[in-house]
Interface confidence: medium
């Protein structure tokens, strides 16, 4: 049965774009208009979960890409990746729950909560060029984003 | 109060079809899947395939060379068609309805039909 | 196409804690679900998404599910309780449920 998907661009509240800086690891820096299209394009698809009001249940994938952003436990933190997945399995609509984040909309922004560690988010740090990761919404770090649609 | 009531055939003969319809009152018909499992008599329960409000369908594997689901939004209704069946067939013939507010899952289901086949 | 196992029967007297476990390959990725089923009638789901309760459905019930295996819990067993128990999870785009567990309320 066919999943639905939407294309965005990701930026965080400092307007930092998202980029890939090496197979499987994401960095958030400031981009000009010159390389403005490095940033990744994400395919956000409608997934199972527990959908609320302010809560949608997504995965995100990397456009043209087998990559979708996946929460684990490593070293007994919990951990933002980027795994690989076979292209004639995913998406679908019941994904792995470490793949599922809850989108939550707070006024003009957008956060995504790991479904399997609630309480953590995707961020991004105060600096450029740092990874993006998943933090528990602590310090300085930024998890409100901007998301500008794209046409598929 | 959402219901599901089902009806078709209860009594076959090997190698002809089973033919279903399940009847949706009440919620909308669009924004959900709609599946149908079987149980036969002291058995566990055997998913057969779903199909949403467009015609899209997903089998199970192995049922899937001999089962057709089909849909007809204009009555809010969904069908099961299952050819070639064999004793091995006899079972109660579930309807149910997925929803997202559950997680995707099957959280209303039709009475039931019992389906024999018997020569 | 994985498999989901249950224990054939369980039995626990009024007022105690019944567990009945559901375990399958990595079924902690997955979410669980669990259906209760009395005899002659539909199943009834009364946990989703591995511990979530569908509304009508009494606090005694509850899930957890983690590594291989998940549970389901109900505390304070009531006689109206004895019935079929059984789990499902999704595996390869296809549902797939447990071989059922036969509650037993003794008394």
């Known amino acids: 049965v066919p999943i639905r998907q939407l294309h965005y661009r990701l930026r965080d509240e400092q307007q930092k774009s998202l980029v890939l800086s090496d197979p499987y690891e994401l960095k958030a820096l400031h981009l000009n208009g010159q390389n403005i299209n490095q940033q990744v394009i994400f395919s956000m698809s409608f997934v199972q979960g527990e959908p609320s009001n302010d809560k949608i249940p997504v995965a995100l994938g990397l456009k043209g890409k087998n990559l979708y952003l996946s929460c684990v436990m490593k070293d007994g933190t919990p951990t933002l990746q980027l795994e690989s997945v076979d292209p004639k399995q995913y998406p679908k609509k019941k994904m792995e729950k470490r793949f599922v984040f809850n989108k939550i909309e707070v006024k003009s922004k957008v956060e995504f909560e790991s479904a399997e560690f609630p309480n953590w988010y995707i961020s991004t740090s105060q600096a450029e060029h740092k990874p993006v990761f998943l933090g528990n919404n602590s310090g300085q770090d930024i998890i409100d984003f901007t998301m500008e649609s794209v046409s598929s | 109060q959402v219901q599901l009531q089902q009806w078709g055939a209860g009594l076959l003969k090997p190698s002809e079809t089973l033919s279903l319809t399940c009847a949706v009152y009440g919620g909308s018909f669009s924004d959900y899947y709609w599946s149908w499992i079987r149980q036969p008599p002291g058995k566990g329960l055997e998913w057969i395939g779903e199909i949403d409000h467009s015609g899209s369908t997903n089998y199970n594997p192995s049922l899937k060379s001999r089962v057709t689901i089909s849909v007809d939004t204009s009555r809010n209704q969904f069908s099961l068609s299952l050819s070639s069946v064999t004793a091995a067939d006899t079972a109660v013939y579930y309807c149910?309805?997925?929803?997202?507010?559950?997680?995707?899952?099957?959280?209303?289901w039709g009475q039931g039909t019992l389906v024999t086949v018997s020569s | 196409q994985s498999v989901l196992t249950q224990p054939p029967s369980v039995s626990v007297s009024p007022g105690q804690t019944a567990s009945i476990t559901c375990s399958g390959d990595?079924?902690?990725?997955?979410?669980a679900f669990w259906y209760q089923q009395k005899p002659g009638q539909s199943p009834v789901l009364v946990i989703y998404?591995?511990?979530k309760r569908p509304s009508g459905i009494p606090e005694r019930f509850s899930g957890s599910n983690s590594g291989n295996t998940a549970t389901l819990t109900i505390s304070g067993t009531q006689a109206l309780d004895e019935a079929d128990y059984y789990c499902q999870a999704w595996d390869s785009n296809i549902e797939v449920f447990g071989g059922g567990t036969k509650l037993t309320v003794l008394g």
């Open positions: 990595k079924l902690g990725d997955k979410f």
């Open positions: 998404l591995d511990n």
């Open positions: 149910a309805r997925a929803s997202p507010s559950s997680g995707w899952t099957l959280d209303y």
